[in-house]
Amino acid sequence: SNQPPGGGGGSGGDCPGGKGKSINCSELNVRESDVRVCDESSCKYGGVCKEDGDGLKCACQFQCHTNYIPVCGSNGDTYQNECFLRRAACKHQKEITVIARGPCYSDNGSGSGEGEEEGSGAEVHRKHSKCGPCKYKAECDEDAENVGCVCNIDCSGYSFNPVCASDGSSYNNPCFVREASCIKQEQIDIRHLGHCTDTDDTSLLGKKDDGLQYRPDVKDASDQREDVYIGNHMPCPENLNGYCIHGKCEFIYSTQKASCRCESGYTGQHCEKTDFSILYVVPSRQKLTHV
């Protein structure tokens, strides 16, 4: 065979700098918890122990390609491709294997494809119980007075970045599209950046190509949708390193624009401002329930 050996694009466990060297990777995923004793047992699945101030962190250095070639993981989640599955195994430090090529189908159909973590999709399984199927990152709250699917999506950390969605409505940020999708329990996709205009034909919004398969929710993906209809988040390119001071840079593929997802306690376009409201006791955000 003439198949090239080794890495085809740097998506393996190491960034170009290699293990133990000083690196500058566009997609460096570090586990949040310190690894006090960083060794082969505490930093597995392609992770590399890195010094981080006082402690050590298990760094998962994966520069994944974003071709949408879904695989079903042994944890029941669908991943954008096998690289994202491996990256998830590293990030969560648990074994995840490919159990099937193609998405995990626990039911007929699935969700919106845009979720919270890593700009990723929500879980692929629908969660069944008294509520019936809860989709689009909704969870069943059986303790609630009116049993229903509860949406705990928090969009407060996102900067202003208006988008036009497939339901014909304008939203102040892609996160709010996910929230609406969750609340309404229906698929709502991002059509384009900016508010909806009179020229937007709602009959065409969200319409899919004849040859394209319906795409299920994807876990731990940068969620670059490769068809023209939907603009989702993907990691920012290397030239935008440092764009977000205290937050995560996310790239909206369809519009080629960057957006910052701020860490708790920061706000502003580049997450450069301290959000003093975090210092005060704020009433808990009311759960949004779909009955």
Epitope: N2, G9, G12, Q63, H65, N67, C83, G102, G211, Q213
Partner: antibody, heavy 121, light 107 residues
């Protein structure tokens, strides 16, 4: 050895349809993404479409969306391109090519010899 | 979609010359870049993948470099058999766009 053999090209009138085939041999077909690439006479290469592995993921260049359908028959190790509503600008040599993408991704290491599609009235 | 821009569109050099072709992506593509050689009337042939990895069987006078948005293909000492059109291609995500090509001729 790896072989990709295209067929189905020919002269067709605008608005009509044509179905291209690519017979693959010498490798495990299901472990590769299969692509169509075209080259208009005297012009550069243009990627057209891909179908991955089991056929559950496929993508197209904008100019052929809604007109062309890529598919594969893994039991016969064959790739297809159904071309509908053909236009003069679809005139080109059409190549099939294989690419391996999984945990990592590789470009086209093998190409077919190409089949010429001429759209003319 | 990400655009791939090659320069120059054509060049003429002498046998033994060092030749460099550049390719620029409109957005970062990490090192998911390939270079192909297409001789007149022939099928394209993979030269370089992952921006800098030489494909098996390709002469060592060919080399690639770059990451992110800027890439280059270098022929360290041009040979008559290198007369061809060279294409770059991104493959990190669909569409797998090609550059417009660079035609290399011998003076």
């Amino acid at each position: 050895q790896v072989q990709l053999v295209e067929s189905g090209g020919g002269v067709v009138q605008p608005g009509r349809s044509l179905r291209l085939s690519c017979a693959a041999s010498g490798f495990t077909f299901t472990t590769y993404g299969m692509h169509w690439v075209r080259q208009a006479p005297g012009k550069g290469l243009e990627w057209v479409a891909v179908v991955w592995f089991e056929g559950n993921s496929k993508f197209y260049i904008d100019s052929v969306k809604g007109r062309f359908i890529i598919s594969r028959d893994n039991s016969k190790n064959t790739l297809f391109l159904q071309m509908n509503s053909l236009r003069a600008e679809d005139t080109a040599v059409y190549y099939c090519a294989r690419a391996n993408c999984g945990a990592d991704c590789y470009p086209f290491d093998y190409w077919g010899q190409g089949t010429l599609v001429t759209v003319s009235s | 979609d990400i655009q791939m821009t090659q320069s120059p569109s054509s060049l003429s050099a002498s046998v033994g010359d060092r030749v460099t072709i550049t390719c620029r992506a409109s957005q970062g593509i990490s090192n998911y870049l390939a270079w192909y050689q297409q001789k007149p009337g022939k099928v394209p042939k993979l030269l370089i993948y992952a921006a800098s990895t030489l494909q098996s069987g390709v002469p060592s006078r060919f080399s690639g470099s770059g990451s992110g948005t800027d890439f280059s293909l270098t022929i360290s000492s041009l040979r008559p058999e290198d007369v061809a059109t060279y294409y770059c291609q991104k493959y990190n995500s669909a569409p797998w766009t090609f550059g417009q090509g660079t035609k290399v001729e011998i003076k």
